[in-house]
Structure formats: C-alpha cells, structure tokens
C-alpha cells in the first residue's frame, strides 16, 4: 500500500489515522528533503490532488482540513515543489478509514448443524462498521468453568470434539475495533438442544390417476434424530400465498406425503425439519416443481425407480439433488 | 472413501469377555450416523447387536443388554464392542458398520472371526 | 421383536432370468426394508433402503418393492456376479432384524 513507499518526511491524521465517519480531520505534511526549501507543498487523495482547504503552518509544513469524512478508505499522500526540481517529490503517504465503533453483538445463536461435527455460532453484529472489526466468541463450560475464546471475523465453527466440559455452555461475543469495544448479552445452551437434523430433501413427485388424482412427494433426510417434526409447504407457482403441512416424522424409511391439486397447474414445494420440542429450524429444501398433469394424466417422465404404485397412469417429476445432500443456509 | 475394519482375538475362553476394536478413517466418528456392531453365525444368521451414536449415546439388542457395553475413542477414531460372560454361543464372524441415517448400514468392515472355545 | 421371514432358503435361476426374493415382516415396517448381498467371504452389501430405493452405485437391474409386511426383491436379468445370499433387514425399529437368507444358485 501506500505506507509502503520511503519518505522523505513524515504525514500525519490528527484525531487519528482511523477515526469516526463523519469527523472533521486534519491531515499534516511535513517535508524533510534535502537541499530542498519546499515552494508548496500539495496533498493527493487516491491519486487526485486537492485544491481546497490547505494552509501552509511554516516552511516545511502544511495542513489540508476535511469537513465530515465520509469515505471509508482512503490513500493520501503529499509532495513538495522544490526549486530546480521540474517534477514535484513525494514527502511521504498513510492510508487514512473511517467508521463506527461496533454495536452490541445480539441474537447470539450457536446451532449444530447435525453431521457437522461443529457447532456454529452466529450474531447480528448491527450496522456496518467500514473498519476492521474482530469478535472474540467467549464459550464457557457450566460444568467445569473452564473458558475458551476463539477469535473470528464473522461467525465462528467450533469443533465438537474441542467441547469437552460437558453439555451446558454459557456463549457471548466481545466485538473490538479501532473504535470501540462492546460485549454481547450471555446465550445458555444445552448441545443436545440445538441440533439441526440433516437436511429434508424432496426427491420426486408423481401425480397418481385415480377417482380423484392425487400427488405424491417422495421426500427424505438422513438424520439420525428419531423425533422429528417436519412442515411442508406449497403453493400454485402463480400464488402468492403457501399451504402447510405438518408432519411428525420417522425417517427410518423415504417419506410420502399426499395432496389432492387441481390438475394443469405448476406446483413448487419445500420442507424444513426440527427435532422434536427443539429451537431451531432447517432452512427450507430447495424449490421442488411439479406440474400436475391435466384429468387424463400423461406419463412425462420415468422415476428412477418404484413398484409401489401398480396401476393408474403417473405424471412423475425428479429432483436434481440426492437424497443424501446436505444443503444448509440460514437459520430458520 | 470411508472405511471400517475389525480387530481383535481369534480365540476367547467361555466364561471371559470379548473385546473387540473397529478402526474408522475417511470419516470422523464424532461428525455423524450411528456406528454399529453385527455378527453372523457359523449357520448365517445376522444379528444386530447394538450402536454408538455420533453423540456417543448407545442403544442394545435387548437379548445382549446385560452383557454388551459399546464405548468409544474419539482420538482414535475408534469404537469398540465388550461382550461379557461369552458361551460357544457367541462363535461367529463380528462386522462393525456404519448407518445410512436411520436407515440401512451402508458401510461394513471386512468382519472378524471369532471362536468361543476352552 | 419383528421378525422377518424369508421363505426360500435356495432360489435356483439361470443367466438372464428375472428372479424375485419375498420377505414377510411379523408386524407393519411401513416400507423400512433394507436388502443386502453378501458373496462368500464378504460381508454384507446394501442395495436397497426403504423398500424400494436403490442404494448408490446399484445397478439399475436390482429393484425393491412393497410396504407394510410384504415385501419383494427382484433382478431382472441375473448375472453370473449375482450369485450370492440375500437378506432382507427391517430398519423400522430396534433391534434391527434380518431375514434369514436366500441363496440364489445357478441351475
């Protein structure tokens, strides 16, 4: 960067060289080049010179004024005209920030998305801060007292094995900058309370001809978690509005679930699954389309294979994904 | 790719315990699925025995209950299978496996033979 | 316990016949039948979970089928490498149960 080059003098911010968006600022150049009684000495902001707000303190030093700094990252730098010089010399440069301090870190939630082998915690760290920002996530064995910190940028995954003080944690988040520092409230956890089983993936569809046609959503995850607790939902791809359903889940085999549709119509679906009583929810699957076939349905496509279903004509959709992928996104 | 292999004595005493180890790599034991203990036979009947699940929990074929114990070391990546109190009975080849979810055991070990006899 | 019964200890076939292995469960598994296949010194093999879902890498000659207590599984054109004992496993709940093998045999 910028800080890199050698100077022949010194530049400085004054309140600071990271301070507060929207402060007035000034920044100071001082030359020290030999054989050199500087004519003028000029100010450059990412490359472009100033024209405004300089005044020249003695013969070796100037200052260039900033009312309300609103740019997160600049590079400055300043030069000298000296006489029988034709071009002018570089004195020195700095890169200046600005931001805010960080806000109390809140809605700390530490999750174990099953088949991990981490739990992941996250937190809404408020408004952006435009500086470098650290979080130190501070988790605590109510067991054994025994305390770790893990430093992150973000959110941070923490090895299951390294939590060896038992099951119940006391979790929070420090959030430090050049700025400021605040401290998150405390989160209590039990591991075995905020598992997220394996994702629920819908597999295929087929819409069975019968007195009164109905659909059927092929549908399975790979949890380990006997009590699961699934819903899901569907609409009309023209509607805004979804349909719910509920399920209480086994998964010791693939999932099928029955809607009766109206025929000829696009139909999008989703599920999402919670162990039994627990917090926190899968994200919802992907988009699962399936049209439904018009009253004398028409074979479109051919599952990968079934021999449940003996007789009546099936309109088949498949999905892309597999059974046993494991997709994760937000926290539901 | 994941693996799995057996080890322990070929031969036991009746009436001493049986103590057996499955190695697993290419998957950590402490990550996911329940890791199980099957044995076989000499006529081919398999029958489950029991699991560790990933959270080290353990479930047990309730006609072993009383003598079976499943323990594990994580640093290790390794699982293991106690049987107390062994008779002739208890003479078979011994599979450790991995379980698709809460379905079928996708992943077994090449299995270990093991004779009951004084 | 459930039990699982396979009726046929033997099942003799020829190359490129099809052939159906049945197994009956002593009460509803729903469709949480596993099938496996195990050549002689092997260890059992997954080809089928929940009745009638091939496992990965499973040729698409192997099929499974029913629900409740029924249950079928078919090849539809044997291969000499088929030649092995098939068991089917209930993985509706513990203890988990086998069937007790059928042998298919070449005639």
């Known amino acids: 960067g910028i800080t890199n080059i050698n100077c022949s003098g010194h530049i400085w911010v004054e309140p600071a060289t990271i301070f507060k968006m929207g402060m007035n600022i000034s920044i100071y150049c001082q030359a020290a080049i030999k054989n050199c009684q500087p004519r003028k000495l000029h100010f450059y902001k990412n490359g472009i010179k100033e024209r405004f707000q300089i005044t020249r303190i003695n013969k070796t030093t100037a200052r260039l004024w900033y009312k309300n700094f609103l740019e997160p990252h600049a590079s400055m730098y300043c030069t000298a005209e000296c006489p029988k010089h034709f071009q002018e010399t570089l004195i020195c440069g700095k890169d200046i920030s600005s931001g805010y301090p960080p806000d109390i870190p809140d809605e700390v939630t530490c999750v174990i998305y099953e088949y991990s082998g981490n739990m992941t915690c996250t937190w809404n760290a408020g408004k952006l801060t435009y500086i470098d920002t650290k979080y130190v996530v501070h988790v605590k064995s109510l067991e054994t007292e025994e305390e770790q910190q893990y430093l992150t940028s973000s959110y941070i995954n923490i090895s299951t094995d390294s939590l060896q003080g038992g099951k119940k944690y006391l979790v929070w988040v420090q959030a430090a900058n050049a700025l400021g520092m605040e401290e998150s409230k405390q989160l209590q956890i039990h591991l075995d309370d905020i598992v997220i089983p394996s994702a629920a993936v819908i597999s295929r569809a087929e819409t069975i001809n019968a007195t009164v046609p109905k659909t059927i959503i092929y549908w399975d995850s790979q949890t380990t978690i006997e009590k699961v607790s699934c819903e899901m939902r569907y609409k009309a791809t023209t509607n805004q509005t979804w349909n719910v359903k509920e399920f209480d889940t086994n998964f010791t085999y693939v999932q099928q679930s029955e809607f009766y549709l109206e025929p000829n119509i696009k139909y999008v679906f989703q599920v999402r699954c919670q162990e039994t009583g627990k917090r926190y929810w899968q994200p919802w699957s992907s988009l699962f389309f399936h049209k439904t076939p018009e009253t004398v349905p028409q074979v479109t496509s051919k599952a990968f294979q079934h021999d449940t279903w003996n007789s009546g004509l099936t309109v088949a959709s498949i999905s892309t994904g597999h059974l046993t992928s494991d997709n994760r996104g937000d926290i539901g | 790719q994941v693996q799995l292999k057996e080890s322990g004595p070929d031969l036991v005493k009746p009436s001493q315990s049986l103590s057996l180890t499955c190695t697993v790599t290419g998957y950590s034991i402490t990550s996911g699925y329940n890791w199980h203990w099957i044995r076989q036979f000499p006529g081919n009947k398999l029958e489950w025995m029991g699991y560790?699940?990933?959270?080290?929990?353990?479930i047990y074929n309730p006609s072993l209950k009383s003598r079976i114990s499943i323990t594990r070391d994580t640093s290790k990546n390794q699982f293991f299978l106690q049987l107390n109190s062994v008779t002739t009975e208890d003479t078979g080849t011994y599979y450790c496996?991995?379980?698709?979810?809460?379905?079928?055991?996708?992943?077994w070990g090449q299995g270990t033979s093991v004779t009951v006899s004084s | 316990d459930i039990v699982m019964t396979q009726s046929h200890k033997f099942m003799s076939t020829s190359v490129g016949d099809r052939v159906s292995i049945t197994c009956k469960a002593s009460q509803d598994v729903r469709t949480a039948v596993a099938w496996y296949q195990q050549k002689p010194g092997q260890s059992p093999k997954l080809l089928i979970h929940?009745?009638?879902y091939r496992y990965t890498g499973v040729p698409d000659r192997f099929t499974g089928s029913g629900s409740g207590t029924d249950f079928t599984f078919t090849i539809s054109s044997v291969q000499v490498e088929d030649l092995a004992v098939y068991y089917c496993q209930q993985h509706y709940t513990t203890p988990y149960t086998f069937g007790s093998g059928t042998k298919l045999e070449i005639k």
């Open positions: 560790i699940h990933y959270s080290s929990g353990t």
């Open positions: 929940s009745a009638s």
């Open positions: 496996a991995r379980q698709l979810g809460l379905k079928a055991m996708d992943y």
